[in-house]
Interface confidence: medium
Amino acid sequence: ESALITQQDLAPQQRAAPQQKRSSPSEGLCPPGHHISEDGRDCISCKYGQDYSTHWNDLLFCLRCTRCDSGEVELSPCTTTRNTVCQCEEGTFREEDSPEMCRKCRTGCPRGMVKVGDCTPWSDIECVHKESGTKHSGEVPAVEETVTSSPGTPASPCSLSG
């Protein structure tokens, strides 16, 4: 697993709070759950629930914990060594092409297709043609074409305030 960071992930702090634990770097690196001091002499612990680091590192700041969006549920909280794990809430999914937002799962398949896969937090329902068994492209059908299994609206993105 790579420590993927973006500029917004860093949790800057000019100096360590007095209560933060310190230890010495090993070959210039600090253990997971810590970052290095500006002078490179100390390892300073990340703040539980606020920031984290997952690898041996020489980061000047720990990485800022992710906050789950309103359309997500928190599977596990942020610790000093692991970021928050968020998942789309029931009835929505996160697709690879737009991972920044949870989209509503379709409520049914287009005419002439049958459902072979349920809505999960990481995938929409899966539809195949009755005869050929080939998968549907995944595009959202027009409302009038949809054979619904329960009342609902076609897929639409959840708004992310991130």
């Epitope: 500029q7 800057p12 070959e27 210039g28 500006e38 980061l59 000047l60 700041f61």
Partner: antibody, heavy 119, light 110 residues
Framework: QVQLVQSGAEVKKPGASVKISCEGS????????LHWLRQAPGQRLEWMGR????????KYSQNFQGRLSITRDTSATTAYMELSSLRSEDTGVYYC????????????WGRGTLVTVSS | QSVLTQPPSASGTPGQRVTISCSGG????????VSWYQQLPGTAPKLILY???QRPSGVPDRFSGSKSGTSASLAISGLRSEDEALYYC???????????FGGGTKLTVL
């Protein structure tokens, strides 16, 4: 988005001074150190010095000691690099970069400022 | 002033794996971690690895790094034409109290 915007190209005569600016935006300027680097034509990158934008502390390379000054204006979220007693060997591209690791992980760079020293 | 030593050039064919070495001393690589940069002609360097082997966001996992003693190396697997660039290693030098760079390795994709 996070960016560092540097001032434009300069042409100077030997013995003169040059002052280049580097404006940071899209992040908490005071929380990072900004480093200055030079790349002479066809040469390796050379570290010049850095400033802690929060407290103003500076550190300079021995190669530039005495003729390099790095300052910052926190209200303008801008760092400045002034090099004096210019000589032809100082011709090159000067970069500012933001550092987020102790060992020189520079994640955001300015586009560079070309300084030409010629009589 | 001591600096880091890199081979001036390296090459490989698309899909191949290439390795670029970076040799230093006890006061830089021996004591601190290494960063690697990719520089395309006429552009600023771009960080591709930090803390010896960590990739910033957006850098493909084809790029990996390692460090042993006073040497470090950058490996690029599944080589692509867009990887053709100049690669620099860098580290902090405690004796000089400053940053040091390698001379750069020009990678050619044949």
């Amino acid at each position: 988005q996070v960016q560092l915007v540097q001032s434009g190209a300069e042409v100077k005569k030997p013995g003169a001074s040059v002052k280049i600016s580097c404006e940071g935006s899209g992040y908490t300027f005071n929380s990072y150190t900004l480093h200055w680097l030079r790349q002479a034509p066809g040469q390796r990158l050379e570290w010049m010095g850095r400033i802690n934008a929060g407290n103003g502390n500076t550190k300079y390379s021995q190669n530039f000691q005495g003729r390099l000054s790095i300052t910052r204006d926190t209200s303008a979220t801008t760092a400045y690099m002034e090099l004096s007693s210019l000589r032809s060997e100082d011709t090159g591209v000067y970069y500012c970069a933001r550092v987020f690791t102790y060992s020189f992980g520079m994640d955001v760079w300015g586009r560079g400022t070309l300084v030409t020293v010629s009589s | 002033q001591s600096v880091l030593t890199q081979p001036p050039s390296a090459s490989g064919t698309p899909g191949q794996r290439v390795t670029i070495s970076c040799s230093g001393g006890g006061s830089n690589i021996g004591r601190n971690s290494v960063s690697w940069y990719q520089q395309l002609p006429g552009t600023a360097p771009k960080l591709i690895l930090y803390s010896n082997n960590q990739r910033p966001s957006g850098v493909p996992d084809r790029f990996s790094g390692s460090k042993s003693g006073t040497s470090a190396s950058l490996a690029i697997s599944g080589l692509r034409s867009e990887d053709e660039a100049l690669y620099y290693c860098a580290a902090w030098d405690d004796s000089l109290s400053g940053g040091v760079f390698g001379g750069g390795t020009k990678l050619t994709v044949l």
